[in-house]
């Protein structure tokens, strides 16, 4: 595989707070050229977060993902651990990027042409039949909002790198984690996750390309480890909300302040990011702006157009 330039594609200025490893499907290390070392974590909703490799929970999570990947391989699933540049991987799933990430159009990097195949069903949900990324969250106020950026994954909002947009050229990532069901953003990862159940179709919904955003944590939204249990309240359903920004600081923990730079490869199509639920916390809709990046497959220029998210709904009524 040809891994384009080795310049730093993702720089992390803010590290995420703890995320349950159960919500993670992959990790990768950023390049040495980035200076500040960081681990890029991908959640089952295909959201990316910067994590501090020195933190114990991050070490434990990587170890856990390594074990899962090894088990997966033993069980016949193929898992490609790729060590290469950290570029947005291509895949039909919508991903989200956190404020800690800034997209940098990269003219040189040629990424591998691997088309990630939807691996087990889990990843699929990110692109599943539903237009929005799975899951809304509940907030301390008791309302579940529509899925906003990080929640479902459980990643702190504020530190999410970005949602991986569909890219015509796949980027290589070093990942060490078994794929959870769903189209995987990691190139060519296949697994047999759940034997005794039907295989959901994997339709990818278009996703917008990652775009950095700096949103302050919404009020009342829970931070990881904090917040109230989501409870429904009269209010919107957590369904049908407009695309939610891929970078929200739902968790106060993951407040703005982290900016990661990600070089982008041409995206084959433009799409809106599906939203993911915010972590359970007060589910107050945030004013987030999904960013749509249109990339001409022939060019590496990126057009980022903020699209205000007009709708937001809470899950439980």
């Amino acid at each position: 595989q040809h891994h384009g330039v080795t310049k730093c594609n993702i720089t992390c200025s803010k590290m995420t707070s703890k995320i349950p490893v159960a919500l993670l499907i992959h990790y990768q290390q950023n390049q040495a050229s980035c200076g500040k070392r960081a681990i890029i974590l991908e959640t089952r909703q295909h959201r990316l977060f910067c994590a501090d490799p020195k933190e114990q929970w991050v070490k434990d999570a990587m170890q856990h993902l390594d074990r899962q990947a090894a088990a997966l391989t033993r069980n016949g699933g193929t898992f490609e651990k790729q060590i290469g540049e950290v570029k947005p991987r291509t895949t039909p799933a919508a991903g989200g990027m956190d404020e800690s990430v800034v997209l940098e159009p990269e003219a040189t990097g040629e990424s591998s042409s691997l088309e990630p195949t939807p691996s087990s069903q889990e990843a699929q949900r990110a692109l599943g039949t539903s237009p929005e990324l799975p899951t809304g969250v509940t907030g301390s106020s008791g309302t579940r909002l529509p899925p906003t950026p990080k929640a479902q994954d459980g990643g702190p909002v504020g530190t999410e790198l970005f949602r991986v947009p569909p890219v015509s050229t796949a980027a290589t990532w070093q990942s060490s984690a078994p794929h959870q069901p769903g189209p995987s953003l990691w190139a060519e990862a296949k697994t047999s996750e759940a034997p005794s159940t039907q295989d959901p179709s994997t339709q990818a919904s278009t996703a917008s390309s990652p775009a950095p955003e700096e949103n302050a944590p919404s009020e009342g939204q829970r931070v990881w480890g904090q917040g109230q249990s989501p409870r429904p309240e009269n209010s919107l359903e957590r369904e049908e909300m407009g695309p939610v920004p891929a970078h929200t600081d739902a968790f106060q923990d993951w407040g703005p302040g982290s900016m990661a730079h990600v070089s982008v490869v041409p995206v084959s199509s433009e799409g809106t990011p599906s939203r993911e639920p915010v972590a359970s916390g007060s589910w107050t809709p945030k004013a987030e702006e999904p960013i749509h990046a249109t990339m001409d497959p022939q060019r590496l220029g990126v057009l980022i157009t903020p699209v205000p998210d007009a709708q937001a709904a809470t899950r439980r009524q």
Epitope: Q121, G128, T129, S130, V137, P232, A279
Partner: antibody
Framework: QVQLVQSGAEVKKPGASVKVSCKAS????????IHWVKQAPGQGLEWIGW????????KFNERFKGRTTLTADKSTNTAYMLLSSLRSDDTAVYFC????????????WGQGTTVTVSS | DIQMTQSPSSLSASVGDRVTITCRAS??????LAWYQQKPGKAPKLLIY???TLADGVPSRFSGSGSGTQYTLTISSLQPEDFATYFC?????????FGGGTKVEIK
């Protein structure tokens, strides 16, 4: 109001199958994972697995793989758990539950369905 | 898999007593712990998540603490409606696992 309403009690013979349903209301069904939990008589709780209704993706506790099938019908906002080749130790109350997206703890539960396996 | 060991398995207390229930994990669960209350014939009810965050509508007499592998649920002043069985659950990694339960009975 978020609600999970499960089907009624079932009595089955060993070797048979049983399908328990869990109808969700009050929220967008396809946005939240539905989990299934087993509680044998006088025992603790055991996580069986989850299904993501948005695309039907399941994940299982290894202990329940093979004889358990999790499905979801988006048109009726209903999740199902099929237990096949029933044995006496499958006798238990089965709960469906759902939670927020920042972690898989369960803030809403169905009322439980008692499955009795007896010859 | 992470095993959750809860103690004591049962205890007798009186209204007004301070009650403490412990849950020990076989591995570090990084504070991703929830506590539930269950009454006979009913579904469990979420009390606390993320080790110490109170779920909506849960009285402040309930509190959670701990880190690493050791966690505690405390009921500062037991009320008549608190007599029930309590379970802990780790949601750090799958398979999610629960403690064996602690039955709080009236002395």
């Amino acid at each position: 109001q978020v609600q999970l309403v499960q089907s009624g009690a079932e009595v089955k013979k060993p070797g048979a199958s049983v399908k328990v349903s869990c109808k969700a209301s009050g929220y967008t069904f396809t946005n939240y994972y539905i989990h299934w939990v087993k509680q044998a008589p006088g025992q603790g709780l055991e996580w069986i697995g989850w299904i993501y209704p948005g695309d039907g993706s399941p994940k299982f506790n290894e202990r329940f793989k093979g004889r358990t099938t999790l499905t979801a019908d988006k048109s009726t906002n209903t999740a199902y758990m099929l237990l096949s080749s029933l044995r006496s130790d499958d006798t238990a109350v089965y709960f469906c539950a759902t939670g927020p997206t920042d972690g898989d703890y369960f803030d809403y539960w169905g009322q439980g369905t008692t499955v009795t396996v007896s010859s | 898999d992470i095993q959750m060991t809860q103690s004591p398995s049962s205890l007798s207390a009186s209204v007004g007593d301070r009650v403490t229930i412990t849950c020990r994990a076989s591995g570090n669960i990084h504070n991703f712990l929830a506590w539930y209350q269950q009454k006979p014939g009913k579904a469990p009810k979420l009390l606390i998540y993320n080790e110490k965050t109170l779920a909506d509508g849960v009285p402040s007499r309930f509190s959670g603490s701990g880190s690493g592998t050791q966690y505690t649920l405390t009921i500062s002043s037991l009320q008549p409606e608190d007599f029930a069985t309590y379970f802990c659950q780790q949601f750090w990694s799958t398979p999610y696992t629960f403690g064996g339960g602690t039955k709080v009975e009236i002395k």
